[in-house]
Interface confidence: medium
């Protein structure tokens, strides 16, 4: 006769491991008992369980409640056992020793491999600001056994670097994604993808990029010079900029206080019916936590009675 087993049995942490051991004997042969032991190199054999044809299943105190026979129907020549709720410490070599009559004893070894699926974590890097050089956007760490694979899925252009740390029964892999921040990256997803044989599908963690910036400021409203004349109603100046975080706007007049009746509504400066006292230099001040910008315009309110053309100067400063 001969023993049938597997070279390697692979289970995921927490699953039940079936340790196979089947005696394929000749007619009339009987199995008296099957002894299972843990036989890691450098350590003595530690009994796991013993299946006896007459006395039944005996379980070592160290494995109490964790070793069972497979559910019926059972073949008397089958010495397989179930190791419940496999843990990392169960990984190693096991020996099945079968005592048969009249053929004698047979033994076989198998290796139990316990896969420990990773629980990945993603950590954003420091705040991203336009104008920085190559900067850490995020790092992703996953620990498992065997070592997981950590990659990145994104439309954003960048570079990756990985490092791994081996522990006694697992390995931790950390991958970093570096980029040169630009405003076009705002709102773009950066996804860490972790692959592992213990996972049914890849695990994905997505981080949305936020890049701080502030665009140059400009003022609209003075495009048609002929509209800025005494008596005109609904005249307004609008300050244009964009940024992350969204900027706040402030209006001032360079050559004095804002005239009475002029309304400030965020990025918009609204005028009452125009008079010559509305002429002057107006400054739009745009700021966020990242930066600040200024844009100034000269308003010259014309008297329609006069024939001279309106002069408008636009000056932008930052």
């Amino acid at each position: 006769g001969e023993l049938e087993t597997s070279d390697v049995v692979t289970v995921v942490l927490g699953q039940d491991a079936k340790l196979p051991c089947f005696y394929r004997g000749d007619s009339g042969e009987q199995v008296g008992q099957v002894a299972w032991a843990r036989v890691d190199a450098g350590e003595g054999a530690q009994e796991l369980a013993l299946l006896h044809s007459k006395y039944g299943l005996h379980v070592s105190p160290a494995y109490e409640g964790r070793v069972e026979q497979p559910p019926p129907p059972r073949n008397p020549l089958d010495g397989s056992v179930l190791l419940r709720n496999a843990v990392q410490a169960d990984e190693g070599e096991y020996e099945c020793r079968v005592s048969t009559f009249p053929a004698g004893s047979f033994q076989a070894r198998l290796r139990l491999r316990v896969l420990v699926p990773p629980l990945p974590s993603l950590n954003p890097g420091p705040a991203l600001e336009e104008g920085q050089g190559l900067t850490l956007a995020a790092s992703c760490t996953a620990e498992g056994s065997p070592a997981p694979s950590v990659t990145w899925d994104t439309e954003v252009k960048g570079t990756t670097s990985s490092r791994s740390f081996k522990h006694s029964r697992s390995a931790a892999v950390t991958s970093e994604f570096h980029l040169v921040p630009s405003r076009s990256m705002n709102g773009q997803p950066l996804t860490c993808v972790v692959s592992h044989p213990g996972l049914l599908q890849d695990q994905r963690i997505t981080h949305i990029l936020h890049v701080s910036f502030l665009a140059e400021a400009s003022v609209r409203g003075l495009e048609d010079q002929n509209l800025w004349h005494i008596g005109r109603e609904g005249a307004m100046l609008k300050c244009l900029s964009e940024g992350q975080p969204p900027p706040s706007y402030n209006w001032t007049r360079l050559d004095g206080p804002l005239p009475s009746g002029v309304r400030v509504d965020g990025d918009t400066l609204g005028f009452p019916p125009l008079t010559t006292e509305h002429s002057g230099i107006y400054v739009c001040h745009v700021s966020n936590e990242f930066s600040s910008r200024d844009s100034q315009v000269t308003v010259d309110v014309l008297d329609p009675q006069e024939d001279s053309g309106k002069q408008v100067d636009l000056v932008s400063a930052s």
Partner: nanobody, 118 residues
Framework: EVQLVESGGGLVQPGGSLRLSCAAS????????MGWYRQAPGKQREYVAT???????NYADSVRGRFTISRDNSENTVYLQMDSLRAEDTAVYYC????????????WGRGTQVTVSS
Amino acid sequence: EVQLVESGGGLVQPGGSLRLSCAASRSTFSLNIMGWYRQAPGKQREYVATITSGGSTNYADSVRGRFTISRDNSENTVYLQMDSLRAEDTAVYYCTAELVRRGPTTYWGRGTQVTVSS
């Protein structure tokens, strides 16, 4: 040939405890399985518990959680700690040992009486 000698039996009240011992005349390392059976008056011999040379154990459902089998290979002795005894545990308790060679050889002791009564 292996001689098995039991001791520790006696009279005990319900809920009480007893500890049976069984000494073997040869090293228990070579004795593959040792254990206990019992026989009540007018009944068949009934399995109680067994222990392997490596310390793995098995129990009859009727005693699981109340009885504990242990083994001291250096003293060539097997023990049966019996707690929460009941009247139905009254029986002659026999030590058994099995030697595995080309076929299983089973040895028996003469037995020790356990009586549970108030």
